[in-house]
């Protein structure tokens, strides 16, 4: 049967026809009464007095209805959830997850997870509706949770008509002994002991850091991993691990060269909800090596949005050759990332200037092929990008990836919704297209334009009648990715480049293949 | 700190290949390039790898000779050289590259007589 | 292919002395990235190379600051300001800006 559901677009809890809630508004000490009716959330503010017991974890403030029983609490910065149980900060499960408290949603096959509060899972062991949920880290959300001591976070998905529980692709904090680092780096305790430029980090208990504030000295040395030891560490929640070092006989510190651990690729993927010619509105935590780049023109005022992108590290974004033909200078380029609607800023959105941006030397304008440009982001440290569920990198493909004709991938953007459209989309689209044989991807293909081995093609398979709604690229999507599922990862495969039309049938969009240009990617990022 | 540890010496026959390993340990994601020294001669560049997604760079002279792999579960970078000559008697090097060579093998000396 | 020249061929030269080596490439060397990656490598008898400057001007950890590196486009000098006994062997200049990356045919460096 179906249910009449609401959905708190604010914190994405769901609840049940007639159920009513609390809720704090965003940046006021105000409280509003929320309840469920015909699947609308129906809200007002009312009176809130504090909370006669603590009730809030992780310093969260209590707040009670004056006239009845329910509870809010106010969370501190990073913490979510009806009790701030939730750790929005938390890029990495350790052991076996028992303790994860985070918000990664998707599982091993990229489904999404169940709500633990939903009533279809009402008969499961394990529920938000629990008596002992709370402890369990089991609400009304759908993270990845370890309740039962299995051996990492689960949740349950809907797969072949049913609720089943499936592992989550969650990034564990130490694959292995690999010495790398997750998030900033603040539970780094690997080894690494030389900076970016190749100096020796100094140990903690040197005596010629007496003054410090980071020394094996502080009073909370052992928690931030700081000791008899000369190991890269991030104490102070800087951008990534450091350490002090002698530079020309002067004490300074620099960053370390330590490399971060991959987590590439990963997303929490959400089914799209509203379907739209040429593809389907999405999510940017679905796409969050998505990038937007925009352009100031000398000739008019403003910024007006240019091509897609792809976030491939922390500062440098791949697109296509194709969208930089008028020689921009770098300033007059911003990118960002993390927005959901190409021009309303996201709340989580990170805005770059560009640094410099370096179209492949071969690129031809006649027939497009090296389509490839990098744009390096400018920052005042070696970091640009910080990762967050909005914000991540695609994985690059193994040089020796051959995925099989007819592979199913996607592609996003905020590209036109159609060829003749004069504008382009106000919301980020995916598309789902498959990889089509390289026999398929020729001249006598594409109205006799030169197709090079630099390029591959992909498109829409399904039969399309005259109302049909096949997935394409479009104007707009150009520089942007598509990408397949890899090793559990999605893995850039190609950059879009250019079409015949849009979405039209038999017709594939054609894109520059990425495996032919790992080499040049890794040349021109060099530091 | 980046060691990197190469395979032992070798003696081949002209005609034959020649398999020489490079295990890294530290930071081993850096390129790993290949460069060779013939007895009492410079230097010479053969090609590079990337040790992650295995992408390579080569040296046109010795495009279609020379062979670059690696096996990333255990570290370690492999250069394969074919059709051997008794010119290719050298030592041949590895070395990591992040912002310069700026760590070195042992070096591995490749005999080749016959 | 870049090729780099350097020069002299052979330098003897005298403890506490300066000396100069000069490196000259074919064709500029600034990358299509904005870099110039002129390294410089001393081989010491019997050992691996190992890396002294890096982009033209940089001295790698743990190298004295007797040594220094200069220069443009592409004309390239390593200094030395004041030689020791332990400087000797042979020094390559290299460019690894255009594939194939390339070395000078080297200098070296000997005690009169």
């Known amino acids: 049967s179906y249910q009449v559901i609401c959905r708190d677009e604010k914190t994405q809890m769901i609840y049940q026809q007639h159920q009513s809630w609390l809720r704090p508004v965003l940046r006021s000490n105000r409280v509003e009464y929320c309840w469920c009716n015909s699947g609308r959330a129906q809200c007002h503010s009312v009176p809130v007095k504090s909370c006669s017991e603590p009730r809030c974890f992780n310093g969260g403030t209590c707040q009670q209805a004056l006239y009845f029983s329910d509870f809010v609490c106010q969370c501190p910065e990073g913490f979510a959830g009806k009790c701030c149980e939730i750790d929005t900060r938390a890029t990495c499960y350790e052991d076996q997850g028992i303790s994860y408290r985070g918000t990664w949603s998707t599982a091993e096959s990229g489904a999404e997870c169940t709500n633990w509060n939903s009533s279809a899972l009402a008969q499961k062991p394990y529920s938000g509706r629990r008596p002992d949920a709370i402890r369990l880290g089991l609400g009304n959300h759908n993270y990845c949770r370890n309740p039962d001591r299995d051996s990492k976070p689960w949740c349950y998905v809907f797969k072949a008509g049913k609720y089943s529980s499936e592992f989550c692709s969650t990034p564990a904090c130490s694959e292995g002994n690999s010495d790398c680092y997750f998030g900033n780096g603040s539970a780094y305790r690997g080894t690494h002991s030389l900076t970016e430029s190749g100096a020796s980090c100094l140990p903690w208990n040197s005596m010629i850091l007496i003054g410090k504030v980071y020394t094996a000295q502080n009073p909370s040395a052992q928690a931030l991993g700081l000791g008899k030891h000369n190991y890269c560490r991030n104490p102070d929640g800087d951008a990534k691990p450091w350490c002090h070092v002698l530079k020309n006989r002067r004490l300074t510190w620099e960053y370390c060269d330590v490399p971060s651990c991959s987590t590439c690729g990963l997303r929490q993927y959400s089914q799209p909800q509203f379907r739209i010619k040429g593809g389907l509105f999405a999510d940017i935590a679905s796409h969050p090596w998505q990038a937007a780049i925009f352009a100031k023109h000398r000739r008019s005022p403003g910024e007006r949005f240019l091509c897609g992108g792809i976030l491939i590290s922390s500062c440098w974004i791949l697109s296509a050759a194709h969208c930089f033909q008028e020689r921009f200078p770098p300033h007059h380029l911003t990118v960002i990332l993390g927005r959901t609607y190409r021009v309303v800023p996201g709340e989580e959105e990170q805005k770059f200037e560009v640094e410099k941006y370096i179209v492949h030397k071969e690129f031809d304008d006649d027939t497009y092929d090296n389509d490839i440009a990098l744009l390096q982001l400018k920052s005042d440290s070696s970091r640009c990008a910080q990762e967050s569920s909005v914000v991540r990198t695609v994985c690059l493909p193994p040089a020796d990836l051959q995925l099989p004709d007819w592979t199913e991938c996607e592609l996003s953007g905020y590209g036109k919704h159609e060829a003749l459209s004069p504008f382009y989309s106000e919301r980020l689209k995916e598309a789902h297209v498959r990889l089509y044989p390289s026999s398929r991807c020729t001249s006598q293909h594409l109205l006799n334009r030169t197709v090079t081995d630099n390029m591959l093609c992909a498109g829409d398979t399904r039969s399309g009648g005259p109302q049909a709604n096949l997935h394409d690229a479009c104007q707009g999507d150009s520089g942007g990715p598509l990408v397949c599922l890899n090793d559990g990862r999605m893995t850039l495969v190609g950059i879009i480049s250019w079409g015949l039309g849009c979405g039209q049938k038999d017709v594939p969009g054609v894109y520059t293949k990425v495996t032919n240009y790992l080499d040049w990617i890794r040349d021109n990022m060099r530091p | 700190q980046v060691q990197l540890v190469q395979s032992g010496a070798e003696v081949k026959k002209p005609g034959a290949s020649v398999k020489v390993s490079c295990k890294a340990s530290?930071?081993?994601?850096?390129?790993i390039n290949w460069v060779r020294q013939a007895t009492g001669q410079g230097l010479e560049w053969m090609g590079r790898i990337d040790p992650g997604g295995g992408s390579t760079g080569y040296a046109q002279k010795f495009q279609g000779r020379v062979t670059l792999t690696r096996d990333t579960s255990i570290s370690t970078a492999y250069m394969e050289l074919s059709s051997l000559r008794s010119e290719d008697t050298a030592v041949y090097y590895c070395?990591?590259?992040?912002?310069?060579?700026?760590?070195w093998g042992q070096g591995t000396l490749v005999t080749v007589s016959s | 292919d870049v090729v780099m020249t350097q020069s002299p061929l052979s330098l003897p030269v005298t403890p506490g002395e300066p000396a100069s080596i000069s490196c000259r490439s074919s064709?500029?060397?600034?990358?299509?990235?904005?870099?110039?990656?002129l390294d410089w490598y001393l081989q010491k008898p019997g050992q691996s190379p190992q890396l002294l400057i890096y982009?033209?001007?940089n001295r790698a950890s743990g190298v004295p600051d007797r040594f220094s590196g200069s220069g443009s486009g592409t004309d390239f000098t390593l200094k030395i300001s004041r030689v020791e006994a332990e400087d000797v062997g042979v020094y390559y200049c290299f460019q690894g800006s255009h594939v194939p990356w390339t070395f000078g045919g080297g200098t070296k460096v000997e005690i009169k």
């Open positions: 064709q500029s060397i600034v990358h299509s990235n904005g870099n110039t990656y």
């Open positions: 982009k033209v001007s």
């Open positions: 070395a990591s590259y992040y912002y310069a060579m700026a760590y």
């Open positions: 530290g930071n081993t994601s850096y390129w």
